[in-house]
Interface confidence: medium
């Protein structure tokens, strides 16, 4: 048994550039030839335990065999040289691992950053994958002095072991080396102070101003290498519920500062702020954002009065009427604070007025049949809104002027209403709507529109396949005009049930069918037409179409003494629904006819 190998493969540590050719040789020792009665022609080459085809093998002399590989692509191959001892037993002589890859590319995009409080970190693009063990070394020097090399663990970045010296330029480059070659990046020359990324500003606080409801004052603490650097700031803000940030113009925060007043904000609104900083020259890197801080602007008086309307309950036989004044709570954007109460002033003549302070959104008062003026203002802790004024005319006054060409239509899942204004200047419009139902009262919702509006959508939560009665009333300085109403659907559906048909009169050859209109709760849309299907037990089905305004129809040309089956369907724009089937029999003889 030989302890030493029978021979060797050269090169012993082969590294090949991908796509190139490669030749290895196996040299057998003389002692091995004699021991096993072999020569180089007995050598079998294998890659990863598979025999190499003979055409790739050359016997150079009695001790030496070569193998050639073309276009090497596998990253790692186990190459072994084996002999057929005594001409038949395969025995391993030697083995090597053949690696393939690429020489390193020249590193590019070398950049360095000094994170405040840490050493300098440089990063680069190593280029294409080498598939080989490749060492990247970050080199740095002053004009007169070299700094310790930085050996990269990841091949794309390295943090130097020394603290940077500011206000002195440094030269930095990267060297890359593997078994196939060595290359250097372009060097970069810079002052580390121009590569600083400050720590984020901290202790950001937000305070409001009682004097100005449109501002918030920010203050914060900046680091800037312990005051060594002057920093400029970048401030962003958003309302509490928004997802996008609003940018304070950078030119407003260019000078070093630790406080700032943000203007043009909405009253009584919560804002969230964040801030970051950079060297005031703009060189270096922006810090990460600070922790967010929030603050709420101070209240301002409500920016407009509430929508204001009234409903009258006539009191017959009495000297006064009950009037329900109603208004809408202001949206936050107009309330500008917490609404404490509403002030209603009712005036019957210049000398008689009554003031009410109301916390809710309605007030019922008793008025005589005279003309009244009602004014309404909303109040928060800063002050009162302007007043909305309504004239409540005498019930004996007939309302003149109404809107014309009133239309309603669904679009984009909203119910739109449009009209042509009356010929007299309008103060505002009131839209009222409710679901028409035979099972429940029409509970009205309402909204107010400015005088300039003649197209809007209903702003309540509307239901599909419900019939809405919509009323539009123009309001003038002298009081409400005439009201115009129509019916509309947000979205129609097929009726919930079809009509129940019956016979009103049956003759020998004709029958008068009658039916009731489908209740509005089951219509689910505008009934456009009906179809009447009728047949005998053996005959073909006949269908007639009837306009939706009808509630009866005469079937003619019927056979006498015959059983007929009838069914009706009602159709909306979205489809139809059959009612129950009904049967009747025509008589054998007409009235007064004898067999």
């Amino acid at each position: 048994q030989l302890l030493e190998p029978c021979g060797y493969i050269y090169p012993e540590f082969p590294v090949v550039q991908r796509g190139s050719n490669f030749t290895a040789i196996c040299v057998l020792k003389e002692a091995c030839l004699q021991h096993y009665y072999v020569n180089a022609s007995y050598i079998v080459w294998k890659t990863n335990h598979a025999a190499v085809p003979r055409e790739q093998v050359t016997v150079i002399n009695r001790t030496t065999s070569s193998v050639t590989f073309t276009d090497v692509v596998l990253p790692s191959v186990q190459l072994t040289c084996n002999i057929l001892s005594f001409g038949q037993i395969e025995q391993n002589v030697y083995g090597v691992t053949m690696l393939s890859g690429f020489p390193p590319d020249k590193p590019t995009n070398l950049t360095c950053i000094v994170n405040e409080g840490k050493n300098m970190l440089c990063q680069w693009d190593p280029g294409r994958e080498t598939y080989l063990e490749t060492n990247y070394t970050l080199k740095s020097e002053w004009a007169t002095e070299k700094f310790p090399d930085c050996q990269s663990k990841h091949g794309t970045s390295c943090m130097v072991s020394y603290m940077p010296t500011y206000y002195v330029n440094i030269e930095v480059w990267v060297e890359a080396e593997n078994a196939l070659g060595k290359v250097s990046s372009e060097s970069i020359n810079f002052d580390p102070v121009d590569k600083v990324k400050p720590t984020p500003p901290y202790n950001l606080s937000v305070t409001n101003s009682e004097e100005l409801s449109s501002i918030l004052k920010l203050s914060w603490v900046s680091s800037g290498l312990g005051g060594l650097l002057d920093l400029k700031s970048d401030i962003q803000y958003r309302t509490k519920d928004a997802s996008t940030w609003i940018q304070v113009p950078l030119e407003d925060t260019m000078s070093p500062r630790t406080s700032f007043t943000v203007q043009d904000l909405k009253p009584f609104t919560e804002y969230v702020f964040r801030i970051r900083s950079i060297k005031d020259s703009g060189k270096g890197y922006w810090s990460d954002w600070s922790e967010e801080a929030s603050g709420t602007t101070y209240e301002d008086r409500p920016s407009r009065p509430p929508s204001f309307w009234y409903k009258t309950n006539p009191s017959h036989g009495q000297e006064y009427r009950s009037v329900r004044l109603i208004w809408k709570a202001l949206p936050l954007s107009e309330a500008n604070g917490k609404i404490l109460d509403y002030e209603v002033i009712l005036t019957q003549s210049k000398s008689v007025s009554q003031t009410y302070t109301v916390t809710g959104t309605e007030l019922t008062v008793n008025l005589t049949n005279d003309r009244y003026v009602a004014s309404l203002a909303a109040r928060n802790k800063v002050g009162k809104s302007a007043a909305a004024v309504l004239t409540i005319p005498s019930p004996h006054v007939t309302a003149a002027y109404s809107v014309v060409n009133l239309k309603a239509f669904p679009k984009d899942n909203l119910l739109w209403v449009e009209w042509t204004p009356p010929p007299k200047p309008v103060s505002k419009y009131i839209l009222e709507w409710c679901v028409l139902s035979e099972n429940a009262p029409c509970v009205e919702d309402w909204q107010q529109e400015d005088a300039t509006v003649n197209r809007t959508h209903l702003r309540g939560r509307l239901l599909e396949s419900k019939c809405y009665q919509i009323t539009v009333t123009p309001v003038f300085a002298t009081g409400p005009g005439g009201s115009e109403s129509l019916k509309a659907y947000l979205k129609q559906a097929a009726p919930a049930r079809g009509p129940t048909v019956r016979t009103k009169k049956v003759g020998k050859n004709e029958a008068v069918l009658a039916w009731d209109q489908i209740p509005v709760d089951d219509q689910n849309g505008f009934i456009r037409n009906y179809s009447i299907s009728y047949r005998t037990s053996v005959g073909k089905e006949m269908v007639v179409h009837v306009d939706s305004s009808h509630t009866e129809y005469t079937l003619s040309s019927l056979s006498s003494d015959t059983l007929y089956m009838v069914r009706m369907a009602a159709y909306t724009d979205e489809g139809g629904k059959d009612g129950p089937e009904f049967t009747f029999t025509t008589p054998k003889f007409a009235q007064g006819e004898i067999e």
Epitope: I345, S351, S353, T368
Partner: nanobody
Amino acid sequence: QVQLQESGGGPVQAGGSLRLSCVISGFTYRQTFMGWFRQVPGKEREGVAAISTGGGSTVYADSVKGRFTISQDSSKNTVYLEMNGLKLEDTGMYYCAASTVITSESINRGLYQYWGQGTQVTVSS
């Protein structure tokens, strides 16, 4: 329930003064006008003066203008009638009343829903 309680009536010499008070309690509805009315036996109850509790506006019968003053103290839910220069024809039962109706006709008794029991004023020579 609503209760109105008058006080301050009594005998007085012609040309003298009296101050009537009316306390209202149990009023869940916001009253609009408080009024003073008087009635002489055999005659209809007539309006003397009224005050709007919210606006403070006042109305007087022609016969008392310049002599009588109506006022209120909302913190005490009380209405007062200050009567100066009393005349013999001012004698009668004085009633306090509350109305929920806003109107310049506020001494029209038909508009008042709530009434007190009355306090007697007697003017003698």
